[in-house]
């Protein structure tokens, strides 16, 4: 899968929550960021994530679509210069400081079930999705026989009216 342009086709600032309405939050600890899945107290501010959407071409041998074989890839950045990365060896999701061009591990194929319900498939390990495991984000293998609407890999994007990216 190759990204067809170096610039995102659009960017979207949103808060990210699980299908069960737990918030995805990011905390700076010992000069590195930790990712948490937690219930927020009432009126507690949700963390924002900048989603950058890129167009990607299917590998030509995988698809008969020709120029139409496009997918949406996203990168997720909760704070400047940091992006979510797939660590396929450890089956973990980590936040790393990176410079552009971003490594493939920072790209995820966007699947959306409708409206603001989405799943993120690792670009570097097809069939593996960001999911929730033991109150943390992890990489979860989804068999093709399973329905992608399995709840632990579904996330909700809720729009934010703030346009800053801290």
């Amino acid at each position: 899968m190759s990204i067809t342009g170096i610039s995102p086709i659009t960017e979207y600032l949103a808060s990210l929550s699980t299908y069960n309405d737990q918030s995805i939050t990011f905390a700076l600890e010992d000069e590195s960021y930790e990712i948490y899945v937690e219930d927020l107290k009432k009126d507690e501010k949700k963390d924002k994530v900048l989603l950058s959407y890129y167009e990607s071409q299917h590998p030509s041998n995988e698809s008969g679509d020709g120029v139409d074989g496009k997918m949406l890839m996203v990168t997720l950045s909760p704070t400047k210069d940091f992006w979510l990365h797939a660590n396929n060896k450890e089956h973990s999701v980590e936040l790393h400081k990176s410079e552009k061009p971003l490594p493939d591990q920072a790209f995820f194929v966007l699947h959306n079930m409708h409206s603001n319900s989405v799943s993120f498939e690792s670009k570097t390990d097809p069939g593996v999705f960001i999911g929730v495991k033991d109150n943390h984000l992890a990489l979860i293998k989804v068999d093709s026989s399973e329905n992608l609407s399995t709840e632990n890999i579904l996330f909700k994007l809720s729009e934010t009216h703030h346009h800053h990216h801290h």
């Epitope: 086709i9 659009t10 979207y12 949103a14 959407y53 167009e55 299917h58 698809s63 008969g64 679509d65 020709g66 139409d68 074989g69 496009k70 997918m71 949406l72 194929v109 966007l110 699947h111 959306n112 079930m113 409708h114 409206s115 603001n116 329905n147 992608l148 609407s149 729009e159 009216h161």
Partner: antibody
């Protein structure tokens, strides 16, 4: 080349049923969301129903919920719209459309030529 | 539900004119907006997706812009073959079309 061919339209009495089919070619059908959109004579476009690429998720316009059913057969590259309890206000040209991106409900990139459904006694 | 309102309903302009069509959403749709063109007796055709991206094969005189609730389709130099009805369409929450703007040549 992407092609979408709708069939099954025609004249039907109120309260009766009709099943529309849309046969797709020129792309990997099982990767894409599919849609039905309608246009009453001389009017604008109205989204009717959507189905995701594996058929596990379906969505409907409120006024057709419980009467219309969208389904797909990925082996035959076909999407269907079963329309029951038809009303005069369902009279329209029905278009089939494909999603713009694999696995994504964002945008419609190609439309068929449409099939006319007339509900009248 | 999100409502989409297009203006004007009918636009009459001369060949070569710069033409601007407007589309307003009832809520923020985060640039999840397309424009399509429908000529008389034909199926709609996608022109612009995600607010400002030109669909393959569409002439570069078409462009889109906007954010939040306000969006615009611009035809930089109107051509006779651009006579059609133009629809905006949002997919941020559900799927909704505007009522259309009919573009005519003076």
């Amino acid at each position: 080349e992407v092609q979408l061919v709708e069939t099954g339209g025609g004249l039907v009495q109120p309260g009766r049923s009709l099943k529309l089919s849309c046969v797709a070619s020129g792309f990997t059908f099982s990767n894409y969301w599919m849609y039905w959109i309608r246009q009453a004579p001389g009017m604008g476009l109205e989204w009717v129903s959507s189905i995701n690429n594996d058929g596990g998720n379906t969505y409907y316009l409120d006024s057709v919920k419980g009467r219309f059913t969208i389904s797909r057969n990925n082996a035959e590259n076909t999407v269907y719209l079963q329309m029951n309890s038809l009303r005069s206000e369902d009279t329209a040209t029905y278009y089939c459309a494909k999603g713009h991106y694999s696995y994504s409900s964002y945008s419609f990139s190609y439309w068929g030529q449409g099939t006319l459904v007339t509900v009248s006694s | 539900d999100i409502q989409m309102t297009q203006s004007p309903s009918v636009l009459s302009a001369s060949v070569g004119d710069r033409v601007t069509l407007s589309c307003k959403a009832s809520h923020n749709i985060n640039k999840h907006l397309d424009w399509c063109q429908q000529k008389v007796g034909e199926a709609p055709k996608l022109l612009i997706y995600f607010t400002n991206n030109l669909q393959t094969g569409i002439p570069s005189r078409f462009s889109g812009s906007g954010s939040g609730t306000d969006y615009t389709l611009t035809i930089s130099s109107l051509q006779p073959e651009d006579v059609a009805t133009y629809f905006c369409f949002q997919y941020n929450s559900g799927w909704t079309f505007g009522q259309g703007t009919k573009v005519e040549i003076k």
